[in-house]
């Protein structure tokens, strides 16, 4: 058993048919001696006296908040959660598996540059009685800072018969160098607690391997004179690092015909333009990334030829 | 070229050189993560690489002030993965064919630390530690995290040296 | 589009030779190795070796050592074997292919096969 | 030479029920094995390398696993066209070899 926070704590349970479970003493914050009882959530049955209670806590029925009284007065709490242990691995019932990049991916985190803010989110078909709680820092064994804002609902989707529900947080390393190469991974950890379940979710990385820039901005087609051809030109989108000579981006033009199943044509430039034979109901996208290191190409910005 | 007495690198070459290491460092290992090679045995294998830190002057500021300490930890890091690409983590098996981008990758290490630092003059290098792993898996390991190490690495190095050939050139 | 073609095939004495053609395009010919794969009827693959095309440097399958001859042309983008003292367990489909950039031997790219038949 | 031994040699698989197929390896290959498939009369084709990369293009019902000796190939659910010959194949050593190959027919 260990503590989670003030009066909240986790008990780490082997779960499989007729296990022993764990025997937990629960102790009165209080500096009285005598006349005080236990109960557990909204149940009057009382279930011992004393300063200290001892029970055995082997499923969920044996979690929750338990509570000392005396003479009708609440002395104190202690919130019991479970964290269960299916052959050796706790369980991850609370998110969902994500399955991107690989399997038992519950956490995706991504950054737009490299100023040390990144975004992590989550998916879960849970909508009620679901708390979280994120930390992170730079390193495990001598960690320094990052500090996380408090995760929110950020989006809802139908799949199917389900609804789908993604949080996410935003963390922001404390000292980051952005010209650094990085030696210690981001450790992001993520407490669930769904009802009485406790559950926690790790994710570690370099800010370099969750790179995906946001899309280059200002695209536009400048026509050349007597030829299909056309200039396409755009730029950096704000919000990736600076200085550019330094923090350099690739970018990917490609065109495409109004069917998914005419030839794309592309082309990739270190420069912030190209030129292009513009096809008629064509589009032309650009997309961009890191030059120098092989992160996530951005989402694709986008104009009609016409 | 970059001398220790402190002249000016030829900052369009070495631009050229890093750019050509960071494409065909991730020719050599494009994967993010290796599956099933199970971290046995990982003494701390790779933890004694020279890394591009905070305080080696290698931020556009720093450059600005004075290049000369970011490019020495650059020749130093550049020697030191040269010396691991032409160990026997890389000539063991499993077995590269002779057309491996890690041959090329080689070259071009030596290549751009020559640059760096033309014959007749001497930064201190760092020591490579000895690393001989027997098994073919412990190798292979070895060689995906050296290969991930060093994409860091010249990444870091191309950045220097583009904005150097941008900003600093005579 | 990276194509192998291979050529040659068809049925010799034993005690024969023959030369197999593999016809590259669709990449940079001396860039990558070519290697050159047989399949005896309801059999599995054999190797039988490489050749790089940009120093005509061959590595052989012991067990092929003498009786193949590995070359290539590179002004007719082409790669060759020769395979010489043909007896009836020659007899299969013999593919060639062209491996990973990442300088690892898996087979991304194969010909069709060539059939040779050793038989009098 | 490495010998790579595949089992079973021939594996009868309804469509849409999952299929296992094992490759062991005579000595230590870490993960350099690939798998391919093969039709009749056709070229082999690559599913996977490094033991359990997918390659482009290959449906996520296909899985590999393993490391150093013992490998296999899954197919979560058979497909009609997965019916066909699989060849394990070691690249970490002088001679690269195959296996025997396994094949998946129709129960």
């Known amino acids: 058993i260990w503590e989670l926070k003030k009066d909240v704590y986790v008990v780490e349970l082997d779960w499989y048919p007729d296990a022993p479970g764990e025997m937990v003493v629960l102790t009165c914050d209080t500096p009285e001696e005598d006349g005080i009882t236990w109960t557990l959530d909204q149940s009057s049955e009382v279930l011992g006296s004393g300063k200290t209670l001892t029970i055995q806590v082997k499923e969920f029925g044996d979690a929750g908040q338990y509570t000392c009284h005396k003479g009708g007065e609440v002395l104190s709490h202690s919130l019991l959660l479970l964290h269960k242990k299916e052959d050796g691995i706790w369980s991850t019932d609370i998110l969902k598996d994500q399955k991107e990049p690989k399997n038992k991916t519950f956490l995706r985190c991504e950054a737009k540059n490299y100023s040390g803010r990144f975004t992590c989110w989550w998916l879960t078909t849970i909508s009620t009685d679901l708390t979280f709680s994120v930390k992170s820092s730079r390193g495990s064994s001598d960690p320094q800072g990052v500090t996380c804002g408090a995760a929110t609902l950020s989006a809802e989707r139908v799949r199917g018969d389900n609804k789908e529900y993604e949080y996410s947080v935003e963390c922001q390393e404390d000292s980051a160098c952005p010209a650094a190469e990085e030696s210690l991974p981001i450790e992001v950890m993520v407490d669930a607690v769904h009802k009485l379940k406790y559950e926690n979710y790790t994710s570690s990385f370099f800010i370099r391997d969750i790179i995906k820039p946001d899309p280059p901005k200002n695209l536009q087609l400048k026509p050349l004179k007597n030829s299909r051809q056309v200039e396409v030109s755009w730029e950096y989108p704000d919000t990736w690092s600076t200085p550019h000579s330094y923090f350099s981006l690739t970018f990917c033009v490609q065109v495409q015909g109004k069917s998914k199943r005419e030839k794309k044509d592309r082309v990739f430039t270190d420069k912030t333009s190209a030129t292009v034979i513009c096809r008629k109901n064509a589009s032309i996208s650009v997309r961009a990334q890191d030059r120098y290191y092989s992160s996530s190409w951005s989402e694709w910005a986008s104009v009609p030829c016409s | 070229r970059a001398v220790p007495g402190g002249s000016s690198p030829a900052w369009t070459q070495c631009q050229q050189l890093s750019q050509k290491l960071c494409t065909l460092a991730w020719s050599a290992h494009p994967l993010v993560g290796h599956m099933d090679l199970r971290e046995e045995g990982d003494e701390e294998t790779t933890n004694d690489v020279p890394h591009i830190q905070c305080g080696d002057g290698c931020d556009p500021q720093g450059l600005r002030d004075n290049s000369q300490f970011c490019l020495q930890r650059i020749h130093q890091g550049l020697i030191f993965y040269e010396k691991l690409l032409g160990s026997d983590i890389f000539t063991g098996e499993p077995s590269l064919l002779p057309d491996s981008p890690v041959g090329q990758l080689h070259a071009s290490l030596l290549g751009l630390s020559q640059l760096l630092q033309p014959e007749g003059h001497h930064w201190e290098t760092q020591q490579i530690p000895s690393l001989s792993p027997s098994q073919p898996w412990q190798r292979l390991l070895l060689r995906f995290k050296i290969l991930r190490s060093l994409q860091a690495f010249v990444a870091v190095a191309a950045r220097v040296f583009a904005h150097g050939a941008a900003t600093l050139s005579p | 589009e990276v194509q192998l073609l291979e050529s040659g095939g068809g049925l010799v004495q034993p005690g024969g030779s023959l030369r197999l053609s593999c016809a590259a395009s669709?990449?940079?010919?001396?860039?990558?190795?070519i290697h050159w794969v047989r399949q005896a009827p309801g059999k599995g693959l054999e190797w039988i070796g490489y050749?790089?095309?940009?120093?005509?440097?061959?590595k052989y399958n012991e067990n092929f050592k003498g009786r193949a001859t590995l070359s290539a042309d590179k002004s007719k983008n082409t790669a060759y074997l020769q395979m010489n003292s043909l007896r009836a367990e020659d007899t299969a489909v013999y593919y060639c292919?062209?491996?990973?950039?990442?300088?690892?031997?898996?087979?991304?790219?194969w010909g069709q096969g060539t059939t040779v038949t050793v038989s009098s | 030479e490495i010998v790579m031994t595949q089992s079973p040699a021939t594996l009868s698989v309804s469509p849409g029920e999952r299929a296992t197929l094992s490759c062991k390896a005579s000595r230590d290959v870490a993960i350099a094995v690939a798998w391919y498939q093969q039709k009749p009369g056709q070229a082999p084709r690559l599913l996977l390398y490094w033991a359990s990369t997918r390659h482009t293009g290959i449906p996520a019902r296909f899985s590999g696993s393993g490391s150093r000796t013992e490998f296999t190939l899954t197919i979560s659910s058979l497909q009609s066209e997965d019916f066909a010959v699989y060849y394990c194949?070691?690249?970490?050593?002088?001679?690269?070899?195959f296996g025997g190959g396994t094949k998946v027919e129709i129960k």
């Open positions: 050749i790089y095309p940009r120093d005509d440097s061959p």
């Open positions: 292919a062209i491996p990973d950039r990442s300088g690892y031997a898996w087979f991304i790219y």
């Open positions: 669709g990449y940079t010919f001396t860039d990558q190795t």
């Open positions: 194949h070691q690249y970490s050593s002088y001679p690269f070899t």
